[in-house]
Interface confidence: medium
């Protein structure tokens, strides 16, 4: 069965800091969305092997990728308090499959000690209702998916 493993469950970062979210998927896959949950869930990125990634304007210049679509690490830089929230990986397949979510807490330096992450994933109630297919971009057929891009993560 299609499955999305997402890590970490929770991460704390200072204002201006960075976080990594990893989405690992088994089975056939068109691409990966990272969505920020909330009253109006918002797509942050869409990543597909070999295809130029798409990034929401609010995160322009603040996102890096490493790996490939089935084992993708998304790095968000220059974090702001408004970036606090739960982010979930959405695997775009014949049906949409979701990761368990990552709670990102962006804190001011002085309040860092007040926050703790538990080992439990964010509550399932925070997960969005899967969007309708019409809300997704047109996707190529699996046979048309090209090879992995030449992307190197610098130290």
């Amino acid at each position: 069965a299609q499955e999305v493993q997402q890590s970490p469950h929770c991460t704390i970062a200072p204002v201006g800091g960075s976080v990594n979210i990893t989405c690992s998927t088994s089975g056939e896959l068109h691409g990966i969305y990272l969505r920020q949950l909330g009253p109006q869930p918002q797509n942050i990125i869409y990543y597909e092997d070999r295809v130029v990634p798409t990034t929401d304007k609010r995160f322009q210049g603040r996102i890096d990728f490493s790996g490939s679509q089935d084992n993708l690490t998304i790095t968000m830089h220059h974090l702001q308090p408004s970036d606090t929230g739960t982010y979930t990986c959405q695997a775009v397949t014949e049906i949409n499959v979701y990761g368990s979510g990552t709670l990102v807490l962006v804190t001011e330096e002085q309040s860092q000690g007040l926050h703790r992450c538990s080992d439990a994933p964010p509550t399932g109630s925070a997960l969005p209702v899967p969007p309708t297919t019409s809300a997704l971009p047109a996707l190529p057929t699996a046979s048309a998916l090209p090879a992995l891009p030449t992307a190197s993560a610098l130290p």
Partner: antibody, heavy 125, light 107 residues
Framework: EVQLVESGGGLVQPGGSLRLSCAAS????????MSWVRQAPGKGLEWVSS????????FYADPVKGRFTISRDNSKKTLYLQMNSLRAEDTAVYYC??????????????????WGQGTLVTVSS | EIVLTQSPATLSLSPGERVILSCRVS??????LAWYQQKPGQAPRLLIY???NRATGIPARFSGSGSGTDFTLTISSLEPEDFAVYYC?????????FGGGTKVEIK
């Protein structure tokens, strides 16, 4: 006004090295992906390499992979292209270009706007 | 890689004429296609992005259309400053690729 000024071009022998620089001004350099595009004399445009805003992710065209290295220094608002093992076919005007800025769901590396004036690299013995 | 084929290679026209330039793509790029103008001795300039959106400061006589694999750039009425080379470019897939260009020259 956005300005991109390339430098570092010149005549170099095959197998030699050059480092191109692109000094940026008029925008928040650290928020934009940047690219190098080249144009051989009398020929069309060829994308060479791109780098993400943070500098952590880089992309290369196959003909330059393993020979060219793109990098950036956000504190100096400068983009670089280190070119090693140069070949005659690398002779071209090299342009640096900034990501276009527009306020819809936009590409991580998108359209080139604006471009610098270019710097000529000639590889010849 | 995605190959972009522009036609014709050269167009000889007079000011005031309507121009239609073609860019055919080897596989679908959705709407991720742009057009650039380059004059002799100058850097290229972005005209149209995402198939049909005019870049900042570009006159309304320039328009783009198409989708998938067939795209056109139309200049409704040629001005003297429009004689130049025009390139299309896709950003759907790596590597980013350009067409070979169409030169619009004065008849």
């Amino acid at each position: 006004e956005v300005q991109l000024v390339e430098s570092g071009g010149g005549l170099v022998q095959p197998g030699g090295s050059l480092r191109l620089s692109c000094a940026a001004s008029g925008f928040t350099f650290s928020r934009y992906a940047m690219s190098w595009v080249r144009q051989a004399p009398g020929k069309g445009l060829e994308w060479v390499s791109s780098i993400s805003a943070s500098g952590a992710t880089t992309f290369y065209a196959d003909p330059v992979k393993g020979r060219f290295t793109i990098s950036r220094d956000n504190s100096k608002k400068t983009l670089y292209l280190q070119m090693n093992s140069l070949r005659a076919e690398d002779t071209a005007v090299y342009y640096c270009a900034k990501d276009q800025d527009f306020d819809i769901l936009t590409g991580y590396l998108n359209w080139f706007d604006p471009w610098g004036q270019g710097t000529l690299v000639t590889v010849s013995s | 890689e995605i190959v972009l084929t522009q036609s014709p290679a050269t167009l000889s026209l007079s000011p005031g004429e309507r121009v239609i330039l073609s860019c055919r793509v080897s596989q679908s790029v959705s709407s991720y296609l742009a057009w650039y103008q380059q004059k002799p001795g100058q850097a290229p300039r972005l005209l149209i992005y995402d198939t049909s959106n005019r870049a900042t400061g570009i006159p309304a006589r320039f328009s783009g259309s198409g989708s998938g694999t067939d795209f056109t750039l139309t200049i409704s009425s040629l001005e003297p400053e429009d004689f130049a080379v025009y390139y299309c470019q896709q950003r759907r897939n790596w590597p980013l690729t350009f067409g070979g260009g169409t030169k619009v020259e004065i008849k």
